[in-house]
């Protein structure tokens, strides 16, 4: 053997080296790669040193047993069935409260004849439930209301008002609360003629008492 | 009707572990989580983890992570959960809980808990 | 992980007033939950998704707020009403519950 160069490199099982043919002078970088399926263990890349050793020693190729790590998804929690996903794994997806999954909840790390191990989906999405509408309510008679839209969205508060001569009695802003169905806070309120509250508001109200119902009456009841 | 029964008191010394059950019974274990929340004496809940009984699979606070271990078996609808490196402040009532359905996020139905206790 | 800032932390009050206790979020979330609680006992589900009744939860008990902001009303309160009442939310995860309202007997 030349006493000038590092010594030949061999191939290695389930994988290649390249360059195929490299020159074994100083400073010489060879990189090893693996075919589908397997994954290096140790250094792929060795280097022809001035003492004329490699600077690591051969590596391997490994069989790949297990998925890569699927990830977090923002808005949710996992469940995890084994720590270091295996073939046979699974991973489940459970969106956080007020926001709902697309794409698949459970995830499966399947084994596959050429190649590494693969998760049976894509991790999914959870995305912000979208909550419904309230319906517009019609304005008080004498009265209007503000905005005056058909559907108003959850959160949106509306106001009522009355024509002049007219009081408001109830919310003058009700509420669109969230949730499912979104509702309004409050009933609508109701205009009523100024003139009037004020007449019954300085009248107190006397009662006679009623004689005894007869039971005729109490049957007509 | 729903039930959740826990297994007895316990008392260890820092540094142990332990190990809690809750026995499931008046509906079908595998489909529905089981969920573990403590409460230390005169203190609020703090929620621990969980445990899919159908597929075997944990998810746990972060803050628990390392030291918690969330198994089942299934043939006798039964959980566990076991603490490791018991500390004094691990010292609580340790509950087993269930949501009302799959997909919700309230704990409606709750076992009597489990008093573990960590002294020298 | 979302804080639960319960108020009152006591709520000294008679039978047959009403009750009002609050619960504020760090961030905004998108229900709340409610617990009663008892000595020695586990905590009991009182409310759930902000006004939700459980069946068997009597209708003086009444849940309602939004955003960072709930309440809890005990309309007419009764003997058996004075526990330690929580929160609960978990629209991020870990879950996190409030620490408490202590409503005690004037």
């Known amino acids: 053997p030349r006493n000038d160069t590092c010594p030949e490199l061999p191939e290695i099982p389930n994988g290649w080296k390249s360059p195929s043919q490299p020159e074994l002078v100083h400073g010489t970088v060879v990189t090893y790669q693996c075919y589908p399926g397997y994954q290096v263990v140790g250094s792929s890349v060795l280097m022809c040193q001035w003492d004329l050793t490699w600077s690591e020693d051969l590596p391997s190729c490994q069989r790949v047993t297990s998925c890569h790590d699927p990830g977090d998804v923002e808005h949710s929690r996992r469940l995890i069935s084994s720590p270091k996903f295996p073939v046979g794994a699974t991973v489940q997806y459970i969106c956080d409260q007020g926001f709902v999954l697309m794409g698949s909840s459970i995830l499966t790390c399947h084994d596959r004849q050429a190649g590494s191990p693969k998760w049976s989906d894509r991790a999914p999405k959870c995305l912000l439930e979208q909550l419904k509408p309230c319906h517009g309510l019609s304005a008080p008679e004498n009265g209007a209301r503000s905005p005056e839209k058909q559907l108003h969205p959850a959160g949106a508060t509306i106001h009522f008002s009355c024509a002049p001569g007219y009081v408001l009695k109830g919310q003058a802003s009700i509420k669109c609360v969230p949730g499912h169905p979104s509702h309004w806070s409050d009933p609508p309120p109701i205009c009523r003629a100024a003139s009037l509250d004020g007449f019954y508001n300085s009248r107190s109200l006397d009662v006679a008492k009623a004689p005894a119902a007869s039971s005729t009456l109490d049957a007509a009841h | 009707q729903v039930q959740l029964v826990q297994s007895g008191a316990e008392v260890k010394k820092p540094g142990a572990s332990v190990k809690v059950s809750c026995k499931a019974s008046?509906?079908?274990?595998?489909?529905?989580?089981m969920h573990w929340v403590r409460q230390a004496p005169g203190q609020g809940l703090e929620w621990m983890g969980e445990i899919n009984p159908n597929i075997g699979g944990t998810g746990y606070n972060q803050k628990f992570k390392g030291r918690v271990t969330m198994t089942r078996d299934t043939s006798i609808s039964t959980a566990y959960m076991e603490l490791s490196r018991l500390r004094s402040d691990d010292t609580a009532v340790y509950y087993c809980?269930?949501?009302?359905?799959?997909?919700?996020?309230?704990?409606?139905?709750w076992g009597q808990g489990t008093l573990v206790t960590v002294s020298s | 992980e979302i804080v639960l800032t319960q108020s009152p932390a006591t709520l000294s009050l008679s039978p047959g007033e009403r009750a009002t206790l609050s619960c504020s979020a760090s961030?905004?979330?998108?229900?709340m939950h409610w617990y009663q609680q008892k000595p020695g006992q586990a905590p009991r589900l009182l409310i759930y998704?902000?006004?939700k009744l459980p069946s068997g939860i009597p209708a003086r008990f009444s849940g309602s707020g939004s955003g960072t902001d709930f309440t809890l009303t005990i309309s007419s309160l009764e003997p058996e009403d004075f526990a330690v009442y929580y929160c609960?939310?978990?629209?991020?995860?870990?879950?996190?519950f409030g620490q408490g309202t202590k409503l005690e007997i004037k």
């Open positions: 961030s905004s979330v998108s229900y």
């Open positions: 998704d902000t006004s």
């Open positions: 609960q939310q978990w629209s991020s995860t870990p879950p996190t």
């Open positions: 008046g509906y079908t274990f595998t489909d529905y989580n």
């Open positions: 809980a269930r949501t009302y359905s799959y997909y919700s996020y309230e704990f409606a139905y």
